[in-house]
């Protein structure tokens, strides 16, 4: 996160850290807990990496430096990458992770509500992006979970900023015209959440952008509302029944 500040315990209890252990172990992506056994993240987190064994998912964590060999983590039972995702293209950058064992909810580890299907009418004015990613373009993973308040921008405005790319309906953009605050590498897969009527909802999944926090280059996020059918289909067909945190 560029231009962010430290988060506090229990502030974003749905935030998870996706870590990979090949030779060394390292944080690679964020993710959002959306049910006892389900995490929503970005498909591109898995580019070039095995879909087995090597992944460790840490929930209820604020400071990555607190993680030791004894820190409990979840393992992956199944990774479901959107069938239309293509490497190095921005579209359909969404993936579901089914955990091997269900997680108990606590004050520091509980799910984020999902938006309504095709939610286009809600005007979100209080949106935040969180993660342990770089604090500058060529930076390093941060220890303490960072948060930053960023306004949504219209897809039309976003398309002007990215003339060479297609900003699809299933994307949502957020950023300041002057730059300075944004997600960055290592934040991918993590949540863009917005508070509306007193409730936090998962509006976007951190996906891509031109650099980080550049002027007139907003961050691009996968628009979760556009994938509600897919999320429900995949979680129900795997579970027999959905265990998602839907809006009241």
């Amino acid at each position: 996160i560029v231009g962010g500040t430290n988060s506090s315990w229990g502030e974003w209890p749905w935030q998870v850290s996706l870590q990979v252990k090949l030779t060394a172990q390292r944080h690679l992506c964020g993710g959002s807990l959306i049910g006892h056994q389900w995490v929503l993240t970005a498909a591109h987190c898995f580019d070039g990496l095995p879909l087995q064994d090597v992944w460790r998912i840490y929930s209820g964590i604020l400071n990555l430096s607190d993680i030791t060999k004894d820190t409990p983590f979840s393992q992956i039972k199944e990774i479901i990458i959107h069938q239309n995702y293509k490497v190095s293209e921005g579209n359909h950058d969404i993936a579901l992770i089914k955990l091997q064992a269900p997680l108990n909810y606590t004050e520091f580890q509980k799910p984020i509500c999902l938006p309504s299907k095709g939610d286009t009418s809600t005007i979100y004015t209080n949106c935040w992006v969180t993660g342990w990613g770089f604090s500058k373009e060529k930076g390093e993973i941060q220890n303490i979970l960072q948060k930053v308040n960023i306004p949504l921008v219209t897809n039309e405005e976003c398309q002007k900023a990215y003339a060479d790319a297609k900003i699809a309906q299933a994307m949502v953009c957020a950023g300041y015209k002057e730059g300075g605050k944004d997600a960055c590498k290592g934040d991918s897969g993590g949540p863009l959440v917005c508070k509306h009527n007193g409730m936090w909802r998962l509006v976007g999944i951190t996906s891509w952008g031109e650099g980080c926090a550049r002027r007139e280059q907003p961050g691009v996020y996968t628009k979760v509302a556009e994938y509600m059918d897919w999320i429900l289909e995949k979680t129900q067909s795997s579970d027999g029944k959905a265990q998602m945190q839907s809006p009241a």
């Epitope: 990979v20 090949l22 690679l28 580019d47 070039g48 990496l49 095995p50 190095s88 060529k138």
Partner: antibody
Framework: EVQLLESGGGLVQPGGSLRLSCAAS????????MVWVRQAPGKGLEWVSY????????FYADSVKGRFTISRDNSKNTLYLQMNSLRAEDTAVYYC???????????????WGQGTLVTVSS | QSALTQPPTVSVSPGQTARITCSGN??????VAWYQQKPGQSPMLVIY???KRPSRVSERFSGSNSANTATLSISGTQALDEADYYC?????????FGGGTRLTVL
């Protein structure tokens, strides 16, 4: 100790085919992206192709697209390069390498085989 | 896919610092690796992620990368450093190598 051993090179006529193999040992083969890089005599390194750990995604240099096919058999710890419609300009030493890749840090190859020579000539 | 440009040759006196450059459009936005290749041998990784050095590589090797140019520096150059050096970057699923630089120790 990581070991990569290429085989299958040799002399082939233009338009012919050849299949290269790379036997891997000393690491968990199914966890790593694998790459083929070639080097024409007296020339520099040229990337040819790479393949993701599961084999689910493959990528090719424009110069070989449609003619070469990369594949892997994780149960045999072996990487392959099927080369069809070979041309004189494909003459090179072909190296197999183990790639380290993720979306944050990009790609680099930390271990290389000794190479196998492919000569395309009539 | 953008090209990476290296000088064909660099000469240095023993004990001096050799600097080999690699230039490309917005190269500073990408992460660069460097490989050393001695005659008749396979390439060997000497720098990755711009500045990081594998444990088996001498501390005399270092790297930097900003704007449009990445640089491999070899301090206290020795005769055994004579080799071809290649830079490499990754861009939108494409692996790109520089043309290579022959380092000669005078």
């Amino acid at each position: 100790e990581v070991q990569l051993l290429e085989s299958g090179g040799g002399l082939v006529q233009p338009g012919g085919s050849l299949r290269l193999s790379c036997a891997a040992s000393g690491f968990t083969f199914s966890w790593y992206t694998m790459v083929w890089v070639r080097q024409a005599p007296g020339k520099g390194l040229e990337w040819v192709s790479y393949i993701y750990p599961s084999g689910g995604a493959t990528f090719y240099a424009d110069s070989v697209k449609g003619r070469f096919t990369i594949s892997r058999d994780n149960s045999k710890n072996t990487l392959y390069l099927q080369m069809n419609s070979l041309r004189a300009e494909d003459t090179a030493v072909y190296y197999c390498a183990m790639g380290s890749y993720d979306y944050i840090w990009g790609f680099y190859s930390d271990h290389w085989g000794q190479g196998t020579l492919v000569t395309v000539s009539s | 896919q953008s090209a990476l440009t290296q000088p064909p040759t660099v000469s240095v006196s023993p004990g001096q610092t050799a600097r080999i450059t690699c230039s490309g459009n917005k190269l500073g936005d990408k992460y660069v690796a460097w490989y050393q290749q001695k005659p008749g041998q396979s390439p060997m990784l000497v720098i990755y992620q711009d500045t990081k050095r594998p444990s088996r590589v001498s501390e005399r090797f270092s790297g930097s990368n900003s704007a449009n140019t990445a640089t491999l520096s070899i301090s206290g150059t020795q005769a055994l450093d004579e080799a071809d050096y290649y830079c490499q970057a990754w861009d939108s699923s494409i692996v790109i190598f520089g043309g290579g630089t022959r380092l000669t120790v005078l």
